[in-house]
């Protein structure tokens, strides 16, 4: 004959669990019903009744089945410097990342506890390594030949531009000026964007160009090359 | 206010390993590049090791590179310092530095009191 | 490596007098260098960056400037507060090397 099947709440046979979606409840001492995503616990069981669910109140969730007798508020709304990626449900709370041009400098479980914007290298630097979701950009000293005259978290080093006749030779911060009305070769005009990022791990000590790291200081005055606010906090 | 504490310095015979630590408070710890840069007995300044927010980009000065091991932990607010096959040369007051965020702005803005590291026999 | 030369290694000059110290670099580092101020016993300050720039609160009688690749450090009207050690410091390519100091003393 087939086994019976139990109806909650029932008591357990001793030694075994409670089936899937079901807890224990100790004061009862009976299997009893979790309450579906969405939903909390409103009356516990008891010997003769199951548990009684009602749903998540606005601002607040459950993702799992669950028997808590409240549900979990939300995290507070996303700050400035993050966009609202997944809303805040009955089933699911708010997720922020950082908005374009920052990153992730502290992560949380889920989404970003502190955003950063993106490094942006200063003239005579360009991107070595892209910034991503939650790592920075990555600047290095252009080499000879190479130049980069902007400001900026995508442009790399570009090469100087090839005269016939040089009338201002190029640095690490300025394209070489020619004479002749054209140059032999010219790059792109346009800033160059480096398209893939680099190796994960970097240990130069040469003394050529390198890449770095870091955000905004107070300490400075506001007429300073201005590393990266200090990034705010999205809890 | 921002601060960078320093410890675990010490006498070490030549040979040996130390590893020092830095606490640091009063800003957003994990958006900053940091390093290690050391004084000598006579008052040389030598910039040791640098490591970038993330931990992902590390530079050592020449003279420490392979013995030197730059590392942090932004959970902790901690920045680490290992150092192995201690030379003389090394004795120095080790201080743990805010910067520079290379390519942006450049420069040391905040130091620690320092450690001592004695490597002597 | 890029030397940083300092000069000069110390002098001794009387409150309210001007002095010039100098850091010269071995090859051009774009103006990315530092100044910093060393009390006996403390740590390093920081002076001026961007080899022109002063740093937060630090008064306006410190000035920086550059001409080539070299690079001053000056300092009007010296004050009791302003005796100590200065060193130089570039941030172009690794090794980010310090000038020798120049130690300025109180006569």
């Known amino acids: 004959l087939p086994a019976q099947v139990a109806f909650t709440p029932y008591a357990p046979e001793p030694g075994s669990t409670c089936r899937l979606r079901e807890y224990y409840d100790q004061t009862a001492q009976m299997c009893c019903s979790k309450c579906s995503p969405g939903q909390h616990a409103k009356v516990f069981c008891t010997k003769t009744s199951d548990t009684v669910c009602d749903s998540c109140e606005d601002s607040t969730y459950t993702q799992l089945w669950n028997w808590v007798p409240e549900c979990l508020s939300c995290g507070s709304r996303c700050s400035s410097d993050q966009v609202e990626t997944q809303a805040c449900t009955r089933e699911q709370n708010r997720i922020c990342t950082c908005r374009p041009g920052w990153y992730c400098a502290l992560s949380k479980q889920e989404g970003c506890r502190l955003c950063a914007p993106l490094r942006k290298c200063r003239p005579g630097f360009g991107v070595a390594r892209p910034g991503t979701e939650t790592s920075d950009v990555v600047c290095k000293p252009c080499a000879p030949g190479t130049f980069s005259n902007t400001t900026s978290s995508t442009d790399i080093c570009r090469p100087h531009q090839i005269c016939n006749v040089v009338a201002i030779p190029g640095n690490a911060s300025m394209d070489a000026v020619c004479t002749s009305t054209s140059p032999t070769r010219s790059m792109a005009p346009g800033a160059v964007h480096l398209p893939q990022p680099v190796s994960t791990r970097s240990q130069h000590t040469q003394p050529t160009p390198e890449p770095s790291t870091a955000p905004s200081t107070s300490f400075l005055l506001p007429m300073g090359p201005s590393p990266p606010a200090e990034g705010s906090t999205g809890d | 206010e921002v601060q960078l504490q320093e410890s675990g310095g010490g006498l070490v015979q030549p040979g040996g390993s130390l590893n020092l630590s830095c606490a640091a408070s009063?800003?957003?710890?994990?958006?900053?590049?940091l390093s290690w840069v050391r004084q000598t007995p006579g008052k040389r300044l030598e910039w040791v090791a640098y490591?970038?927010?993330?931990?992902?980009?590390?530079y050592y000065s020449d003279t420490v590179k392979g013995r030197f091991t730059i590392t942090r932990d932004n959970a902790k607010n901690t920045l680490y310092l290992q150092m192995s096959s201690l030379k003389s040369e090394d004795t120095a007051m080790y201080y743990c530095?805010?910067?520079?965020?290379?390519?942006?702005?450049?420069?040391?803005?905040?130091w620690g009191q320092g450690t001592t590291v004695t490597v002597s026999s | 490596d890029i030397l940083m030369t300092q000069s000069p290694a110390s002098l001794s000059l009387f409150v309210g007098e001007t002095v010039t110290i100098t850091c010269r670099a071995s090859?051009?580092?774009?103006?990315?260098l530092a100044w910093y101020q060393q009390k006996q016993g403390k740590s390093p300050q920081l002076l001026v960056y961007?080899?022109?720039k002063l740093a937060e609160g630090v008064p306006s009688r410190f000035s920086g400037s550059e001409s080539g690749t070299q690079y001053s450090l000056k300092i009007n009207s010296l004050q009791s507060e302003d005796f100590g050690t200065y060193y130089c410091?570039?941030?172009?390519?690794?090794?980010?090397?310090f000038g020798g100091g120049t130690k300025l003393e109180i006569k």
């Open positions: 530095v805010r910067g520079p965020f290379y390519g942006s702005a450049n420069y040391f803005d905040y």
């Open positions: 009063g800003f957003a710890f994990s958006t900053y590049d």
């Open positions: 490591i970038n927010n993330g931990g992902i980009s590390t």
């Open positions: 090859e051009n580092i774009y103006s990315n």
């Open positions: 961007d080899a022109t």
């Open positions: 410091q570039h941030f172009w390519v690794t090794p980010w090397t």
